[in-house]
């Protein structure tokens, strides 16, 4: 199948990993969400509209 | 059955270069993650040297004694290489290939090495 | 960033428990990105634990991984004679780049 890492999804330093789903991405720490796109605040908020419950800052997403 | 296997592991004067190979069978690296090189001086710990993306990113992280010597990069689906420069008799070691697997929200999780292949350096 | 294990060697007796800590000079990535590895004389090491608490495929649950953060402990019960080897912790880090980091093992002895 088509590598689902080639054009570097993963944002922000963010490691990619092909996985079942299709990819997953390890943020570096300070972003978060699917694609590692969402800086996370310093008082621990996120900029995603609504964040899932239990992310934790740099926590992959898939 | 899921095998990595080194070669190209020999006597090498100081000053001198070489590329180890590392060769996965039973799996392609597109869909396992990234490969990497760790290495073990005779009597001593591990030490990681470097990983490339298993896909066509390229993508490579190298411990910081490692940048500017070794070179890691993928030549197939399923060989990868390590290219040392500028070796010295510190350098001896075996060295090893390893595939970096993401597992529950971790990475560099090493779950699959090849036997290892030895360099030694020495006039 | 340096990890900090046990001196070597620990042994125990047989059906005995040994403990070995591992201390990292700072958090390890998400604060449970740490490995645990076993390896024998003339032998690669074999993944036991990963994120510093759950059990790779096919390692008896006499293996235990616990701790976050900095510090870290591996423990062995019920010790066997197969169990005679030396004990690796490996911590991840992000510091404008994916690092990881070794220590320097720990020598379990079987009596």
């Known amino acids: 199948r088509a590598d689902p890492c080639a054009a570097r999804p993963c944002a922000h330093g963010g490691r990619c990993y092909a996985h079942f789903s299709g990819l997953v991405c390890a943020c570096a720490p300070g972003y978060m969400g699917a694609r590692c796109e969402f800086p996370v605040h310093p008082d621990g908020a996120s900029a995603l509209p609504a964040a899932p419950p239990g992310l934790r800052p740099g926590d992959p997403q898939r | 059955q899921e095998q990595l296997v080194e070669s190209g592991g020999g006597l090498v004067q100081p000053e001198g270069s070489l590329t180890l190979t590392c060769t996965a069978s039973g799996f392609s690296f597109s869909s396992s993650g990234y490969m990497c090189w760790v290495r073990q001086a005779p009597g001593k710990g591990l030490e990681w040297i470097a990983c490339i993306s298993g896909g066509s990113s390229g993508d490579t992280d190298y411990a910081n004694w490692a940048k500017g010597r070794f070179s890691i990069s993928k030549t197939s689906s399923t060989t990868v290489t390590l290219q040392m420069t500028s070796l010295t008799v510190a350098d001896t070691a075996t060295y090893f290939c390893a595939r970096d697997v993401y597992i529950d929200s971790t990475i560099f999780n090493f779950n699959l090495w090849g036997p290892g292949t030895l360099v030694t350096v020495s006039s | 960033q340096v990890l900090t294990q046990t001196p070597s060697p620990v042994s125990a007796a047989v059906g005995g428990t040994v403990t070995i800590s591992c201390q990292a000079s700072?958090?390890?990535?998400?604060?449970?990105?740490l490995a645990w590895y076993q390896q024998k004389p003339g032998q690669p090491p074999k993944l036991l634990i990963y994120a510093a608490s759950s059990l790779a495929s096919g390692v008896p649950s006499r293996f235990k991984g616990s701790g976050a953060g900095t510090q870290f402990t591996l423990t062995i019960s019920d010790l066997e004679c197969d169990d005679a080897a030396t004990y690796y912790c490996?911590?991840?880090?992000?510091?404008?780049?994916?690092?990881?980091?070794f220590g320097g093992g720990t020598e379990v002895v079987v009596k």
């Open positions: 700072q958090s390890v990535y998400n604060n449970n990105n």
């Open positions: 490996q911590g991840t880090y992000y510091s404008s780049g994916w690092y990881s980091t």
